[in-house]
């Protein structure tokens, strides 16, 4: 899952300070104990750039190698740069490691535009900023790539969050997490807190900028506002969700349900934009025209191409519409929808035009794949992967960019009958419906 | 086939304002199609953007001008304007006005342009 | 601040000959860029937009190429219409408000 228009992004004005915080209602489920509280080492242990991914840091190796790691909640390999590369100013040396085994197989990852490939092994890895555990896990040493790592991103490797089921070579390769959680009592659960910058950052601000937080085994209450509402995970191989329906300011698309999620729709950290199937994504792009029709702009915006631009502090969100998804609830006929806002799907951009100016791309965009949850709905929620009870949950997140008037929001529950047809049923044929590329 | 003239004073006394009006003849100015532009060039150098309206009413200015312009509509007139405070006589140039076309990309269409000179 | 650089800053060609004009953006701007045409005394006139396509009435002896940082305007076989200044501009941060400094092409 990645490149492009697949990795984290930033949008639109700071967000609250924490004496504006909305009190945060009772959670009405029970928790299982430990799932809950505070992780306060955890907290703030991402970084990012705009578009260009969040990233955690890692240690590998004995004695330890520390490398910053790309969070991907949309692939399951955990793959290190392991060779000198021209954007790398870092990379795991395996020989330098006396926790090193070989597993004598190679692995080879194919992207729409890009690819790397490596050799297996497994190590010895452990989360500065996480919890206080090493674990032995299985890791792919990157020794040639193309269109991979990102000049100027400070990440030198890639954390595939996923199921097993997408791993390549092969279902046999264990993820990270699944090796974590069986060597540790560290619960099956991870929560992330995506952070827009909200404002175009320069060179020296992004370095210096906070991202969020990869919460590992629970959820943090300071991270978000209001309830958790959860989606059933539809199935373990990426995070796939069912989206029921889908609103621009409150007017319905009023497409067959199915479409939405043709061929899956997936939550992924690793895409930078709010990515939908193409009648989707056309019927999307007609209405937010038709609600912000007192400005006109390029077709080249739309695409996702050509920058935008207002003299600084102008920039006219109240144009733009909010985008509602529905996604099934955990009760039956019961959904629920999040909302974002325009600070969330337009992607502030830096070093375009002058200082006195703030330029944003569009980030929504069209997909062959399905939909995909990118950080630009990421970015307006605390996201819970709660993989031991199979669901995902968003709450409004605390970091959440946003102005006066509006506010990202996650609301429910709404009743909708027949949600189970809106998912797609994927013909099985051989290996060849398993896309990695995703650009 | 539709037609842009610029008109108003060709000269200005420094630290006034700079007046100017387009007239759209042969088309209409509430065509959703375009946005109308204008854009100066001083004697002898090269060309500088100051800023389109749609007919909405809807604006973008050049920072570099620093809020001394405002550009508005008359779609009753199928005319726009320029307003420039506070000039001096590096705003001297020749001013033209401009449909913003092609998708609302690009200047395909020009006025003559005027000469507005600023001195006392 | 995308920056557009023009090169040469004059070119001198007799009639029939080619000219090759070259504008060079400091980042790149994708396919988004325009090359107008300007004469003395009078307003410019839109050549090619979006890199490579003319604009209508635009004679087929000019033609523009390039993408991202690198465009060219070629003028297969200049006739004495064609001495004028010539400028590019780039609309990929919109709205377009980045002109280059020009090339004059003159007589020889």
């Known amino acids: 899952t990645h490149l492009g228009i697949r990795l984290p992004l930033r949008s639109g004005l700071a967000g609250p300070p924490l004496g504006l915080r909305l009190p945060r209602e009772t959670d009405e489920e029970s928790e299982e104990p430990g799932r809950r509280g505070s992780f306060v080492e955890m907290v703030d242990n991402l970084r990012g750039k705009s578009g260009q991914g969040y990233y955690v840091e890692m240690t590998v190796g004995s004695p330890p190698q520390t490398l910053n790691i790309l969070v991907d909640t949309g692939s399951s390999n955990f793959a290190v740069g392991a060779a000198p590369h021209p954007f790398l100013h870092r990379y795991y040396q395996r020989q330098l490691s006396s926790t090193y085994r070989d597993l004598r197989k190679g692995v080879y990852v194919p992207y729409t535009q890009g690819k790397w490939e490596g050799e297996l092994g497994t190590d010895l890895v452990s989360i500065p900023h996480g919890p206080n555990v090493t674990v032995r896990a299985n890791i792919a040493a990157i020794t040639e790539s193309d269109k991979f790592f990102i000049n100027g991103s400070n990440w030198e490797g890639i954390l595939g969050l996923a199921y097993a089921e997408i791993a390549r070579p092969d279902d046999s390769l264990e993820p990270f997490f699944d090796s974590l959680v069986k060597q540790t009592h560290i619960p099956n659960i991870f929560s992330l807190q995506l952070c827009g910058a909200g404002f175009p950052l320069n060179q020296t601000e992004a370095l210096a900028s906070v991202g969020g937080s990869m919460i590992i085994g629970g959820i943090d209450h300071s991270l978000y506002t209001g309830r958790l509402w959860y989606t059933p995970i539809r199935r373990e191989w990426y995070y796939e969700v069912i989206i029921v329906r889908v609103e621009i300011n409150g007017q319905d698309l009023k497409m067959d349900c199915k479409e939405y999620n043709y061929d899956k729709s997936i939550v992924d950290s690793g895409t930078t934009n709010l990515r939908l199937p193409k009648k989707v994504f056309e019927a999307a792009v007609k209405s937010i025209k038709a609600a912000s029709s007192t400005e006109k702009f390029p077709d080249g915006f739309w695409l996702g191409e050509q920058l935008v631009c207002w003299q600084a502090g102008t920039t006219p969100w109240n144009i733009f519409p909010v985008i509602s998804l529905y996604l099934m609830g955990e009760v039956t006929n019961q959904s629920f929808r999040i909302t974002i806002l325009p600070q969330q799907y337009l992607r502030p951009v830096e070093d375009v035009a002058t200082s006195q100016d703030d330029c944003y791309k569009f980030a929504v965009s069209q997909s062959s794949t399905g939909t995909v949850m990118g950080a630009v709905i990421m970015e307006g929620f605390y996201v819970v992967f709660d993989r031991a009870r199979k669901r995902i949950g968003f709450a409004v997140s605390a970091c959440h960019v946003h102005d006066e008037f509006r506010t990202a929001a996650v609301e429910g529950p709404f009743v909708t009958a027949d949600m189970e047809d809106c998912g797609y049923n994927i013909p099985q044929t051989d290996e060849s419906t398993l896309m990695t590329g995703r650009a | 086939q539709l037609q842009l003239q610029e008109s108003g004073p060709g000269l200005v006394k420094p630290s006034e304002t700079l007046s100017l009006t387009c007239t759209v003849s042969g088309g209409s100015i509430s065509s959703s199609s375009y946005y109308w532009g204008w854009i100066r060039q001083p004697p002898g150098k090269g060309l500088e953007w100051i800023g389109n309206i749609y007919y909405s009413g809807s604006t973008y200015y050049n920072p570099s001008l620093k809020g001394r312009v405002t550009i508005s509509v008359d779609t009753s007139k199928n005319q726009f304007s320029l307003k420039l405070s506070s000039v001096t006589a590096a705003d001297t140039a020749v001013y033209y006005c401009?449909?913003?076309?092609?998708?609302?990309?690009?200047?395909?269409?020009w006025g003559r342009g005027t000469l507005v000179t600023v001195s006392s | 601040e995308i920056v557009l650089t023009q090169s040469p800053a004059t070119l001198s060609l007799s009639p029939g000959e080619r000219a090759t004009l070259s504008c060079r953006a400091s980042q790149s701007v994708s396919s988004y860029l325009a090359w107008f045409q300007q004469k003395p005394g009078q307003a410019p006139r839109l050549l090619i937009y979006?890199?490579?396509n003319r604009a209508t009435g635009i004679p087929a002896r000019f033609s523009g190429s390039g993408s991202g940082t690198d465009f060219t305007l070629t003028i297969s076989s200049l006739e004495p219409e064609d001495f004028a200044v010539y400028y590019c501009?780039?609309?990929?941060?919109?709205?377009?408000?980045?002109f280059g400094g020009g090339t004059k092409v003159e007589i020889k």
């Open positions: 979006d890199a490579s």
């Open positions: 501009q780039q609309v990929y941060v919109w709205p377009p408000r980045t």
């Open positions: 401009a449909r913003l076309g092609h998708g609302y990309n690009y200047f395909d269409l």
